[in-house]
Interface confidence: medium
C-alpha cells in the first residue's frame, strides 16, 4: 500500500525540511535538572523499538513506521556499549550497575564493582558502588522505583542493592554459608539500604514469611510468602516511616496516590512479576502507565525534585520466550508510560532518559510490504519452500522440527499472541544480544547524550545534570522554577 502523497518528492522534502527546522531550533538547556527520570526498557534493542513503532502505528490504523513513538520524539540520541567486565553479552544485573551507578561490573552481580565475584559473598564488602538514586536521596530529593517485574529483580535492584548474586530475592534464595557471612537478600536491602519514597511493581512473596497466604491467591501455596527468617518486611518498612502506606491492588493504589497524608508508598501487585499487559486484570493490577502516574503524583510534591526509575521489565521476558507479541505489546505500554510522564513533567526542569540494558537476538527482515502485519509472513518462500515470518530469533524455544524439518507457518498462526517465532538454534530460553542499544534524552543537559558511549556514561550524565556526587561542583544554573 503506497500512500499517493509519498510518491511525490515534495512530501519527503517538506517532511525533512520540517525536521531540519526543528533541529536548528534545538537549544541545549544550560540549567541543572531538578528531576531525573530513567525509563529502562529491559531487553529493548533497536529492532524491538522499530518493530514496536510499527505495531503501535498499526494499532492506530496507520501503515506503521511513519508514526513516531513517544521515545522517538526525544531530541538527543546516543549508542550505549552494554558489555559486562567479564562478558561480551551482558545480563540485567551488571548492566544495571553500569547505567545506575556509573561503574561496570561482572555478569549477574548488582551494585558492585568488578572486583566482586559472582556468588562469592566474601567479595562483596568494600566493592559496593552507589547508585544515582541513592545520591539523589542524600541530596534531599524524593526517589521512586516502578517496574513490571518484581521490585527485587535485577534492574530495579540496581537502584538500591549490592549483591554478588542477582537471584538472591529473599533469604530462602541465599545459601546458608552466604547468610552466615553477612550477605543480605535483595528484599531485605530494599527496605534497609536506603529510604525509597515510592516502590511499585511485583514481588510480594519475597516480603513475607513462609506460610503467609497471598491476598490475591490465598489458596495457592506456591504464591505465598517465601521468607525463612520469619520477617514481615512490609510491616518493618511501614513501622519505620510515618505516612507510609502499603497497597496490593489498583484501587488501593489510586486512592493512596491521591491522599496528601501518604508520604511513602509501597505497592506490590503480584507475588512475583506482574502479568503481561495483554493478560493483566485491569480491575486488580495497575498498568505501567498508571504506576508511573501514581509515582509522579507523590514524588513531584518535593520542592527539591525527584529521581524516578521506570522499567518496562517484561519486554525481556517476552523475548526470552520467543514470543514477539508479548515483547512488543510490553514495549508499547512502556512507551505509553513515557508519553504520560512527559505530560506530567516539564522538560524545562526534568531530564528524561530512555534506554535498554541490553538487546536480544531478535530480527526483523524478509522484505515485507509496507502496511503488512508486523507479525505476518515475508512475501516469498524460504529455500525449503515454506513460509517464514518477518520477525525471527537467532536462538530460543522457537526452534521446532516437524518430521525432521522446519514447520510451515500460516499468517493466522504467526499472528497469535501465543506464537513463538522460529529460531536457528534450539534453546530453552532465547538469549540476550551484545550489540549497542539506543539512549534517548530530553531536558536539561540532554545534549550531553551523544555519540557512542560506555553504558556507565548514563549514570554520570544524570549525576552531572542534577549536580549530584561526584559533580556537586557542576557550575550549572539552578533548575527552572527553583526557589532555593
Amino acid at each position: 500500500i503506497i500512500p499517493v502523497e509519498e510518491e511525490n518528492p515534495d512530501f519527503w522534502n517538506r517532511e525533512a525540511a520540517e525536521a531540519l527546522g526543528a533541529a536548528k531550533k534545538l537549544q541545549p538547556a544550560q540549567t541543572a535538572a531538578k528531576n531525573l527520570i530513567i525509563f529502562l526498557g529491559d531487553g529493548m534493542g533497536v529492532s524491538t523499538v522499530t518493530a514496536a513503532r510499527i505495531l503501535k502505528g498499526q494499532k492506530k490504523d496507520k501503515l506503521g513506521p511513519e508514526i513516531p513513538l513517544a521515545m522517538d520524539r526525544f531530541p538527543y540520541v546516543a549508542l550505549s556499549k552494554t558489555y559486562n567486565v567479564d562478558k561480551h553479552v551482558p545480563d540485567s544485573g551488571a548492566t544495571a550497575t553500569a547505567y545506575l551507578c556509573g561503574v561496570k561490573g561482572n555478569f549477574q552481580t548488582i551494585g558492585l564493582s568488578a572486583a566482586a565475584r559472582f556468588n562469592q559473598c566474601n567479595t562483596t564488602r568494600g566493592n559496593e558502588v552507589i547508585s544515582v538514586m541513592n545520591r539523589a536521596k542524600k541530596a534531599g530529593k524524593s526517589v521512586g522505583v516502578v517496574t513490571t517485574t518484581r521490585v527485587q529483580h535485577a534492574s530495579p535492584a540496581g537502584t538500591y542493592a549490592h549483591t554478588v548474586n542477582r537471584n538472591w530475592y529473599s533469604d530462602a534464595d541465599v545459601p546458608a554459608s552466604a547468610r552466615q557471612e553477612g550477605c543480605q537478600d535483595i528484599a531485605t536491602q530494599l527496605i534497609s539500604n536506603m529510604d525509597i519514597d515510592v516502590i511499585l511493581g511485583g514481588g510480594r512473596k519475597y516480603m513475607f514469611r513462609m506460610g503467609t497466604p497471598d491476598p490475591e491467591y490465598p489458596d495457592d501455596y506456591s504464591q505465598g510468602g517465601t521468607r525463612l527468617d520469619g520477617k514481615n518486611l512490609v510491616q518493618e518498612w511501614l513501622a519505620k516511616r510515618q505516612g507510609a502506606r502499603y497497597v496490593w491492588n489498583r484501587t488501593e493504589l489510586m486512592q493512596a496516590s491521591l491522599d496528601p497524608s501518604v508520604t511513602h508508598l509501597m505497592g506490590l501487585f503480584e507475588p512475583g512479576d506482574m502479568k503481561y499487559e495483554i493478560h493483566r486484570d485491569s480491575t486488580l493490577d495497575p498498568s505501567l502507565m498508571e504506576m508511573t502516574e501514581a509515582a509522579l503524583r507523590l514524588l513531584s510534591r518535593n520542592p527539591r525534585g525527584f529521581f524516578l526509575f521506570v522499567e518496562g521489565g517484561r519486554i525481556d521476558h517476552g523475548h526470552h520466550e520467543s514470543r514477539a507479541y508479548r515483547a512488543l505489546t510490553e514495549t508499547i505500554m512502556f512507551d505509553d508510560a513515557i508519553e504520560r510522564a512527559g505530560q506530567l513533567t516539564s522538560e524545562e526542569d526534568t531530564l528524561s532518559l530512555v534506554t535498554a540494558d541490553h538487546s536480544h537476538v531478535f530480527s526483523f527482515g524478509g522484505y515485507p510490504l509496507r502496511g503488512s502485519s508486523i507479525f505476518g509472513l515475508a512475501p516469498g518462500k524460504a529455500r525449503d519452500r515454506k513460509a517464514y515470518t518477518v520477525l525471527l530469533y537467532g536462538n530460543g524455544p522457537g526452534y521446532v522440527l516437524k518430521d525432521g524439518a522446519r514447520p510451515d507457518v500460516t499468517e493466522s498462526e504467526s499472528g497469535s499472541p501465543e506464537y513463538r517465532q522460529q529460531s536457528a538454534v534450539p534453546l530453552d530460553e532465547e538469549t540476550h544480544a551484545g550489540e549497542d542499544v539506543a539512549v534517548f534524552a530530553r531536558g536539561p543537559q540532554a545534549h550531553l547524550v551523544h555519540g557512542v558511549q560506555e553504558q556507565t556514561f548514563i549514570a554520570h550524565v544524570m549525576a552531572f545534570a542534577a549536580c549530584l556526587e561526584p559533580y556537586t561542583a557542576c557550575d550549572l544554573a539552578p533548575p527552572a522554577g527553583t526557589t532555593d
Partner: antibody
C-alpha cells in the same frame, strides 16, 4: 465469584443452525480470553473456539473440526459470549461448555467452566 | 497442531491406593499442561495447571510432573469421590485435550 451460564441448546435438524449464549459475571469480561468446549456422549472433551481479550483485539481461533461452520463472538457491554453454529451434523451432538482462561504463569489455562448446555442434532 | 495421547483410557484401583495417568504431547509444550476432573452433569474441574501447581482448594493427594513432551498426573490415598474421568489439556499452542482416563474403584 466467577459465574458462567450457558443457554440456547436443544434439538436441531442436520444442516440447521443454532446459537449458544454464555452469560458471564463476577469478573471484568473484557480482560479475559473465552472459549467454547464440547463433549459428545461417551467421547472426550474437545476445544472448539477461542476469542481473546480487549488487549489483543478480540481475535479468534478455531479448531479444524468447526472452522468455517462455527463463529465465536462476544457482547462486551452485556458480558455475553456467543457460539453461532451453522451446517450442523449429527457428530456435533454434545454438551457445550463455555470456559474462561486464567493467566497463571503466563499461560492461558481454562480455569472456570459453566454447567453446559445440551445440543442434539437429529432428523 | 499439537496432539495429546493420554493413557490408560481406563483404570481400576483400590481405596487408599495410588494411580498414575500419563499424557504425551506430539511436541514440546513447555510445561503448559493442566489436569481436569470431569463428572457427568458438571463442568470440568481444574485440578492442576502449569504441570504441577495445584489449584486453590485442591487436596495435595493430587500431583503432577513432567517436562518437554512427557507428563504425568497422580492421585494418592484414593477416596470414593475421586471416581471420575480425568483429562489432560495442553495450552502452549491453543488447546488440545487428551482422550481421557476413566477411573473406577475396585
Amino acid at each position: 465469584e466467577v459465574k458462567l451460564v450457558e443457554s440456547g441448546g436443544g434439538l436441531v435438524q442436520p444442516g440447521g443452525s443454532l446459537s449458544l449464549s454464555c452469560a458471564a459475571s463476577g469478573f471484568t469480561f473484557t480482560d479475559y480470553y473465552m472459549s467454547w468446549v464440547r463433549q459428545p456422549p461417551g467421547k472426550a472433551l474437545e476445544w472448539l473456539a477461542l476469542i481473546r481479550n480487549k488487549a489483543t483485539g478480540y481475535t479468534t481461533e478455531y479448531s479444524a473440526s468447526v472452522k468455517g461452520r462455527f463463529t465465536i463472538s462476544r457482547d462486551n457491554s452485556q458480558s455475553i459470549l456467543y457460539l453461532q453454529m451453522n451446517a450442523l451434523r449429527a457428530e456435533d451432538s454434545a454438551t457445550y461448555y463455555c470456559a474462561r482462561a486464567s493467566f497463571y504463569y503466563d499461560g492461558k489455562v481454562l480455569a472456570y467452566w459453566g454447567q453446559g448446555t445440551l445440543v442434539t442434532v437429529s432428523a | 497442531d499439537t496432539q495429546m495421547t493420554q493413557s490408560p483410557s481406563s483404570l481400576s484401583a483400590s481405596l487408599g491406593g495410588k494411580v498414575t495417568i500419563t499424557c504425551k504431547a506430539s511436541q514440546d509444550i513447555n510445561k503448559y499442561i493442566a489436569w481436569y476432573q470431569y463428572k457427568t452433569g458438571k463442568g470440568p474441574r481444574l485440578l492442576i495447571h502449569y504441570t504441577s501447581t495445584l489449584q486453590p482448594g485442591i487436596p495435595s493427594r493430587f500431583s503432577g510432573s513432567g517436562s518437554g513432551r512427557d507428563y504425568s498426573f497422580s492421585i494418592s490415598n484414593l477416596e470414593p469421590e475421586d471416581i471420575a474421568t480425568y483429562y489432560c489439556l495442553q495450552y502452549d499452542n491453543l488447546y488440545t485435550f487428551g482422550g481421557g482416563t476413566k477411573l473406577e474403584i475396585k
